[in-house]
Amino acid sequence: SPSPVTPSPTLKELIEELVNITQNQASLCNGSMVWSVNLTAGMYCAALESLINVSDCSAIQRTQRMLKALCSQKPAAGQISSERSRDTKIEVIQLVKNLLTYVRGVYRHGNFR
């Protein structure tokens, strides 16, 4: 059974938060770099696996917590290891924008989980 008992953030809420932190922003988290990830391999956990390494950046903490709640809901989520491009680092804002684009596509097609 899912661990956090409060309903997980909806895809719509995640999109709203991602829009909120990226609008009018050229950079996030002082230009911190993170590993690029393949979002098709379980987008919540994949994005979290990269973003969890970002610290001292209040701007993305809510996103991190949302992804954690969504990733926690997945069956055996903790055991799934997403595909990471260990040779490619991108700025946090680029990963967040990539995630926003991907999540919007999922939302439009109604494939929420």
Epitope: I52, N53, S55, A77, S81
Partner: antibody, heavy 119, light 107 residues
Framework: EVQLQQSGPELVKPGASVKVSCKTS????????IYWVRQSHGESLEWIGY????????TYNQNFKDKATLTVDKSSSTAFMHLNSLTSEDSAVYFC????????????WGQGTSVTVSS | DIVLTQSQKFMSTSVGDRVSITCKAS??????VAWFQQKPGQSPKALIY???NRYTGVPDHFTGSGSGTDFTLTISNVQSEDLADYFC?????????FGAGTKLELK
């Protein structure tokens, strides 16, 4: 400097309820969640849940979903935890905390509030 | 829920020694483990986050390492003020969970 000041010790009877407060200062209250943690006598730590003062959103540990209710008062930068239907098993020290540097890693803690349930 | 096992409930040491406290997760938590120190009657104090990052003000004789399921807090050149309980925390998944703790005491 981030500070969290908790309310004083409580001695309550079985079946009663109690409300523990956590007054914060030294940072913008809506920027970070308030976490609540329980420590039974001489035992380990158990995460109860957190509340995000920004929007009032809560996430609970399933083990505490019927026991604890988390709220905030933004005007006084204070978080509250209401504990209901208390039994001797709920006798413990309850801590509030915030996580600023790393998400969900509580580095600023209140001094703890001792709750004793006894008839 | 993810279970964190601190297999040694007690560890005996002497001032100047080097000790390693271990924490094993029941599933892969990447590098999302933190370490706390707690002295009697006090609140926990955060030492390490994301497996190996020290908080500001934490002495550099505290070192965290590990990833996946196996994590270690190493205290080199143990001082008398280091005698305390040490807890690990996984912050990869909800609910957040703590290890049962390891008490560091003098031989």
């Amino acid at each position: 400097e981030v500070q969290l000041q908790q309310s004083g010790p409580e001695l309550v009877k079985p079946g009663a309820s109690v409300k523990v407060s956590c007054k914060t200062s030294g940072y913008s209250f809506t920027d970070y969640p308030i976490y609540w943690v329980r420590q039974s006598h001489g035992e380990s730590l158990e995460w109860i849940g957190y509340i995000d003062p920004y929007n009032g959103g809560t996430t609970y540990n399933q083990n505490f979903k019927d026991k604890a209710t988390l709220t905030v008062d933004k005007s006084s930068s204070t978080a509250f935890m209401h504990l209901n239907s208390l039994t001797s098993e709920d006798s413990a020290v309850y801590f509030c905390a915030t996580a600023v540097v790393a998400t969900d890693v509580m580095e600023n803690w209140g001094q703890g509030t001792s709750v004793t349930v006894s008839s | 829920d993810i279970v964190l096992t601190q297999s040694q409930k007690f560890m005996s040491t002497s001032v100047g020694d080097r000790v390693s406290i271990t924490c094993k997760a029941s599933q892969n938590v990447r590098n999302a483990v933190a370490w706390f120190q707690q002295k009697p009657g006090q609140s926990p104090k955060a030492l390490i986050y994301l497996a190996s990052n020290r908080y500001t003000g934490v002495p550099d004789h505290f070192t965290g390492s590990g990833s996946g399921t196996d994590f270690t807090l190493t205290i080199s050149n143990v001082q008398s003020e280091d005698l305390a309980d040490y807890f690990c925390l996984q912050h990869w998944n909800y609910p957040l969970t703590f290890g049962a703790g390891t008490k560091l005491e003098l031989k």
